[in-house]
Structures are given as structure tokens and as C-alpha cells.
């Protein structure tokens, strides 16, 4: 059962797995919901009636039967994870804490000019985990406006006490704004030699990089293989750390594979999600449950409905015993990931899905894709919105793209004349326009929000949010597109596509149903050459064939330009201007994404 | 009331050495910021070094600086004094606020002191 309102001068009595000092209660439970056993926590605020030494304490809490007995204590706060809800979750934290001082280890420490300057160093730096801004009221000259930058080994601080004219708060590259580089490559017959700051068992290297994303001290990771030659280090993934940030050595070893923390680029790479099953493969560990089950899809599902449950193990059944039922192990331990792996048993292993709502709900997959053709299927961009406007008649106006449950991301450009809000319908999961009719539900837009450095399209900022009336429920024909990671600016986009509902040439109409056209990415220096009279900057992007004939045209506008890198869709573009449609040597331009993503953040997490 | 007793003072030769140390009781736990004051008779108390128990900062009025050292860990503070002078004869007291300040009347809770005299 979720509960997401906290109990006020209420305890929960036993069931410690360990305590932690976070600044607020509110950030006690996400705390609790990261961890990989708790399900309930006590805070305690500062309180004259109250130990000092329990100030700021955040105790994280087990219970078998999900719930423990309730005492009153004044100053005590108390709640549940959100592991038990439904809802989409985050670690990103933006709030600043006024006259608190957190602890941690100070490796750096430099002037800034305001604590929002402190934070964003925080959140460019590997290693840091929160900060302490001294601000120009301190009373100690000599540290007026130091920034420190801390880290600890669980990433929250390791005690947090009353400090006038100090503020303190958190790195944001859990909220996507950190432009430290993602290096997304898993590197082959390849070892780290750095300190380990952590080892666990995984199936693979993928899950151990996921762990490693995860874990706050983790830089980059080594993984042996299962046939790897030493049989006691087969399936272990080592997190590792350095001083520099990047590995000092790397050994050519057969069958070990490396690769990096993805840490600033993890709203758009599935993180908690370990969807695989694992053959032949038996999870070892702490038992919570043996159920009978038909096959290991539904296995997971009961792992998945167990709110303890981490991982499981499913033995098919003998021939023809217990009515065709397999065994189902349930199963949890103290970090979340099996105590010891085994290969050749015949089991089929994997992971509870309970925590993918702790992933962004854009890195879920989709359908396959439809290969060849011009006309899209449904469910195939199930991001892609069409805008209507209802004035002076109900007619298709642009493209737009679900980036949240209540924003949609369009072009400005769109807008020209555009009195109101109240004009403008938004209908998600269609395909063709003639399924729109006086009936069909739609979302009203509350609010239009245009960049405000707009001026036209060919001059850039070309960019605008619609806050939607109501939010959107996701479903296979209605969710979100990842937005592109200020970490991934380096990445080489190779399977892009445009659509969008627009003319199919020049001087034609709106298309029925709705269009796909794969294009390649252009440099920003070629494209240049193809618009001597414009200035293409680094804040558009252009795509299009050399020789012209796929490209988005009117109608389009607002739309999106999606990439598909490391089986996640990206919004690279928004279809923005052109010269003609599919002309020979001139590209279609895009805002680029990338470069917005602090102001798509800025408006959309504006309280 | 908040406890925080100060000991290791005592009577040393010019150019020596002497380590105070501070224990407190949770309330120090929670204060960001303790000092060292002195006292000598019939002047002002004034401060000797500050710091920040969480983050660190550290201040020293001029006359010790390069001479005297603050420190901590856990809930205690320390104050390691070289190259004593007779100048630094006074009562040692320890403190515990939320201000990082020189001034005496930012911090909340106080220790009795202990004696330091130095002789030339």
C-alpha cells in the first residue's frame, strides 16, 4: 500500500538497518526509497525538547510485515518509502538548506559568487556529493563566499549541524544537469586497476555499470565474466574510484570488461530497471518466498508485486509435476543484488521491476519498428503529439513532443497569432488525423511558454513548453521522450528520424496519417556552407540527405527530430525552418535540445 | 544546561607547550561552530580560535597565529599551544553557538574554564 504523507511526532519502533543525516524528512524518504531494503524511516528535526545528537538523524527501517509499531515523540517524523507506490520517482534534489552545515570530506574549496554558483560547480565535479556555501553575511571575513565541495562514501552527509549564514544542498546531476561527459562505452578484455570502493555480484556488465551508475562513489567499473578463469571472482562486479576521476590504468585481461559510471546522463538510461532474464543462471540469496509459478515471466511478476522481493530464481517443472508449475524463489539481500551467481543449474534468474518507476519513464522500450515505408504504425512514436488550434475552424497547427505528464515540448514559431491558450487542443496516441472527432478527448493547454530571446525561427530559440490542464497517463501509445543529456553532447547520432503529419511537398496538404522519414545528421559547419545568408549556431541542428527528397515540411514544425542511441529515444531536434522541403543541398534545421535543457528544466521544475 | 568541561590547562616555562581539550555533551553535536576564548584578569574575554565543526573553517586572532592549533573530532575540541609566551596567561574557556563570530555573546553554551599561566 503507497502512504506518502509523513507522520508528525510519530516514531517507528525497531526494524533499524541504519542511520543516515539528511537536512529535511522530505528528503529522509527518498533517501529510504533508494536504499534497497528500507521501506519505512523516523526522522528527527532540530528541537529544544529533543536530543541534540538525534538532530537531523534519519533512521532507515525493515519490517516483514511492511509496517512497525507507532510511538509518539515529539520532533520525530516519520513515513514510508515510495517503493511502495506507483508513481514516478526521483533523487533530484534543488533545495538550498539555510544556517545548516553538512559534513562530509572538503576536497575543494574555492570563492563563488552565490550559493546557485556553489551548486553548479557541485554538480560539474565528479566527485561531489553536496556543498556548504559560507555567504557574504558570514561573520568570518577570510570565508565569505568559500564553496565546499564534499564527498562521503554514501553520498549524504556523515552529520549535519547549525551554522548562521551558511547554506548547503545537493549536486543536481541526478536532476540532468551536469555537463561532466557520459562515456557510454563498455570496453572489452579490459581492467580497471583503481581502488575498489565496492564489489558486488552481477549477471552481466551491463547490470554492473547500471550498479555502479547508481552507487554514489562509484567513477567507473571492472566485471568478470563467467568465464573468467578465476572461479571465486566470476560474476563480480568491482566499483571503483580515483582521485582524477578516471582510471589510471587500464590491463588488456581476457574475458573482464570495463566501463564508466553514467551518472550525469542517468534520466535518460534505464538505472534500476534489469529487465533481462538469465538463463541457466541461479541468483543466490536471502529466501523470502518459494510459490508456485507457471513460467519465469510470471515469476517476475510476483517478485515484482512482493514489495521485499529483489530477485528470483524460477526452476522449470519436471515433466509433467504440479500442474505444469515451475518453483519460484523469492529473494533479497543487504545491497539489493544476489550473494553469489551459479551457472548450469538450469534456473532462469532476474529482477524485480518494481524499481523501473525510479528510472525516467521516457527509457522504457517500444515496439519494434516498422523497417521501410513512409507512414508510421501505432505505437510507434508515441511521444509525437498533434497540436490543433480551434480558431477560426479545428485545424492540425504543429507538431509537439510528451516530455512530462503535463508538458509538451513544440516550436515557437507555432505561436504566431496564437492569442490564447484556450484555443489549442492537444491529442496524443494518434495516428491519423481523421480519427479526431468532435468527441475524441484532448488535452487543454493552460499555458504557452515561449522562449523569450524568440524572435523568428531562422534566428534560433525557436523553442516553446505547453503546461497541459490535466496530466498525462502513460501508456503504450502516450509517453515521453528522453531528453538529450547535456552529458552526451559529444555523442554521433546515426538513426534519426523525423515525423510529423505535415505537407509531403511544398505546396500539397496535411497528411492523414502520420509520416516517418529516416535522416542523417549534417554538421553544423556543412550546413553553414547550404545557408551562406543565415547564421546556423550552435543551438540549431541540421539533418537532411545531400541530394534532398526526406525531409519535414509545413506542418511538421514543432515536431520531433528522435534519435535512438543505447536503445533509448532521444529528442534531438524540434523541427524548426528550412529553405523548401526535401530541396537538394539544403538541410532542414532543428533547435537543438541539448542546448535548452537547462531552460526546459528551469520551467518545467518551476515551483 | 548544556555541559562542555575543559581540561589539560596548567603552569608551563615560556616556549612550551600545553593541549586543552573540550568535551561536550549532544548539544555540541548540533552547534555548527566552537571556539576557544580567553580571559585574563581585569581584561576583556576574547576570542582565540574558532571553528566550524562541520565544514572546517578555522580562525586564529593574530597573536597566535603559526603558534597555537584548533582541532577536533567526534564531539571534542582541542587547542594545541606552542611557543607559549607570558602573554597568554589567562582563563581558557571552550564555546558552542551557531555563529562562526569573534563575539563572546554569540555563543550559547560555555564551559567553567581552565588555567593557564605561563611563567618567564
Known amino acids: 500500500e503507497c502512504v506518502t504523507q509523513l507522520l508528525k511526532d510519530t516514531c517507528f519502533e525497531g526494524g533499524d538497518i541504519t542511520t543516515v543525516f539528511t537536512p529535511s524528512a522530505k528528503y529522509c524518504q527518498v533517501v529510504c526509497t533508494y536504499h534497497p531494503r528500507c521501506l519505512l524511516f523516523t526522522f528527527t528535526a532540530e528541537s529544544p525538547s529533543e536530543d541534540p545528537t538525534r538532530w537531523f538523524t534519519c533512521v532507515l527501517k525493515d519490517s516483514v510485515t511492511e509496517t512497525l509499531p507507532r510511538v509518539n515523540r515529539t520532533a520525530a517524523i516519520s513515513g514510508y518509502s515510495f517503493k511502495q507506490c506507483s508513481h514516478q520517482i526521483s533523487a533530484c534534489n534543488k533545495d538550498i538548506y539555510v544556517d545548516l552545515d553538512m559534513k562530509g570530506i572538503n576536497y575543494n574549496s574555492s570563492v563563488a559568487k552565490s550559493a546557485q554558483e556553489c551548486q553548479e560547480r557541485c554538480t560539474d565535479d565528479v566527485h561531489c556529493h553536496f556543498f556548504t556555501y559560507a555567504t557574504r553575511q558570514f561573520p568570518s571575513l577570510e570565508h565569505r563566499n568559500i564553496c565546499l565541495l564534499k564527498h562521503t562514501q554514501t553520498g549524504t552527509p556523515t552529520r549535519i549541524t547549525k551554522l548562521d549564514k551558511v547554506v548547503s544542498g545537493f549536486s543536481l546531476k541526478s536532476c540532468a544537469l551536469s555537463n561532466l561527459a557520459c562515456i557510454r562505452d563498455i570496453f572489452p578484455n579490459t581492467v580497471f586497476a583503481d581502488s575498489n570502493i565496492d564489489s558486488v555480484m552481477a549477471p552481466d556488465a551491463f547490470v554492473c555499470g547500471r550498479i555502479c551508475t547508481h552507487h554514489p562513489g562509484c567513477l567507473f567499473f571492472t566485471f568478470f565474466s563467467q568465464e573468467w578463469p578465476k572461479e571465486s571472482q566470476r560474476n563480480l562486479c568491482l566499483l571503483k574510484t580515483s582521485e582524477s576521476g578516471l582510471p589510471s590504468t587500464r590491463i588488456k585481461k581476457s574475458k573482464a570488461l570495463s566501463g564508466f559510471s553514467l551518472q550525469s546522463c542517468r534520466h535518460s538510461i534505464p538505472v534500476f530497471c534489469h529487465s533481462s532474464f538469465y538463463h541457466d543462471t541461479d541468483f543466490l540469496g536471502e529466501e523470502l518466498d518459494i510459490v508456485a509459478a507457471k513460467s519465469h515471466e510470471a515469476c517476475q511478476k510476483l517478485c515484482t508485486n512482493a514489495v521485499r522481493c529483489q530477485f528470483f530464481t524460477y526452476t522449470p517443472a519436471q515433466a509433467s509435476c504440479n500442474e505444469g508449475k515451475g518453483k519460484c524463489y523469492l529473494k533479497l539481500s543487504s545491497n539489493g543484488s544476489p550473494t553469489k551467481i551459479l551457472h548450469g543449474r538450469g534456473g532462469i534468474s532476474g529482477y524485480t521491476l518494481r524499481l523501473c518507476k525510479m528510472d525516467n519513464e521516457c527509457t522504457t522500450k517500444i515496439k519494434p519498428r516498422i523497417v521501410g515505408g513512409t507512414a508510421s504504425v501505432r505505437g510507434e512514436w508515441p511521444w509525437q503529439v498533434t497540436l490543433h488550434t480551434t480558431s477560426p475552424t479545428q485545424r492540425h497547427l504543429c507538431g509537439g513532443s510528451i516530455i512530462g505528464n503535463q508538458w509538451i515540448l513544440t516550436a515557437a514559431h507555432c505561436f504566431y497569432g496564437v492569442e490564447s491558450p484556450k484555443i489549442l487542443r492537444v491529442y496524443s496516441g494518434i495516428l491519423n488525423q481523421s480519427e479526431i472527432k468532435e468527441d475524441t478527448s484532448f488535452f487543454g493547454v493552460q499555458e504557452i511558454i515561449i522562449h523569450d530571446q524568440y524572435k523568428m525561427a531562422e534566428s534560433g530559440y525557436d523553442i516553446a513548453l505547453l503546461k497541459l490542464e490535466t496530466t498525462v497517463n502513460y501508456t503504450d501509445s502516450q509517453r515521453p521522450i528522453c531528453l538529450p543529456s547535456k552529458g552526451d553532447r559529444n555523442v554521433i547520432y546515426t538513426d534519426c528520424w523525423v515525423t510529423g503529419w505535415g505537407y509531403r511537398k511544398l505546396r500539397d496538404k496535411i497528411q492523414n496519417t502520420l509520416q516517418k522519414a529516416k535522416i542523417p545528421l549534417v554538421t553544423n559547419e556543412e550546413c553553414q556552407k547550404r545557408y551562406r545568408g543565415h547564421k546556423i549556431t550552435h543551438k540549431m541542428i541540421c539533418a537532411g540527405y545531400r541530394e534532398g527528397g526526406k525531409d519535414a515540411c509545413k506542418g511538421d514544425s514543432g515536431g520531433p527530430l528522435s534519435c535512438k542511441h543505447n536503445e533509448v529515444w532521444h529528442l534531438v531536434g524540434i523541427t524548426s525552418w528550412g529553405e523548401g522541403c526535401a530541396q537538394r543541398e539544403r538541410p532542414g534545421v532543428y533547435t537543438n535540445v541539448v542546448e535548452y535543457v537547462d531552460w526546459i528544466l528551469e520551467k518545467t521544475q518551476a515551483v | 544546561q548544556v555541559q562542555l568541561q575543559e581540561s589539560g590547562g596548567g603552569s608551563v616555562q615560556a616556549g612550551g607547550s600545553l593541549r586543552l581539550s573540550c568535551a561536550g555533551d549532544g548539544y555540541t553535536y548540533s552547534m555548527g561552530a566552537m571556539a576557544w576564548f580567553r580571559q585574563a584578569p581585569g581584561k576583556e574575554r576574547e576570542g582565540v580560535a574558532l571553528?566550524?565543526?562541520?565544514?572546517?573553517f578555522i580562525s586564529y586572532t593574530d597573536s597566535v597565529k603559526g603558534r597555537f592549533t584548533i582541532s577536533q573530532d567526534d564531539a571534542k575540541i582541542y587547542l594545541q599551544m606552542n611557543s607559549l609566551k607570558p602573554e597568554d596567561t589567562a582563563m581558557y574557556y571552550c564555546?558552542?553557538?551557531?555563529?562562526?563570530?569573534?563575539?563572546?555573546?554569540?555563543?550559547?553554551?560555555w564551559g567553567q574554564g581552565t588555567q593557564v599561566t605561563v611563567s618567564s
Open positions: 571553528i566550524a565543526t562541520s565544514s572546517g
Open positions: 564555546a558552542a553557538g551557531t555563529q562562526f563570530s569573534w563575539s563572546p555573546g554569540s555563543y550559547n553554551y
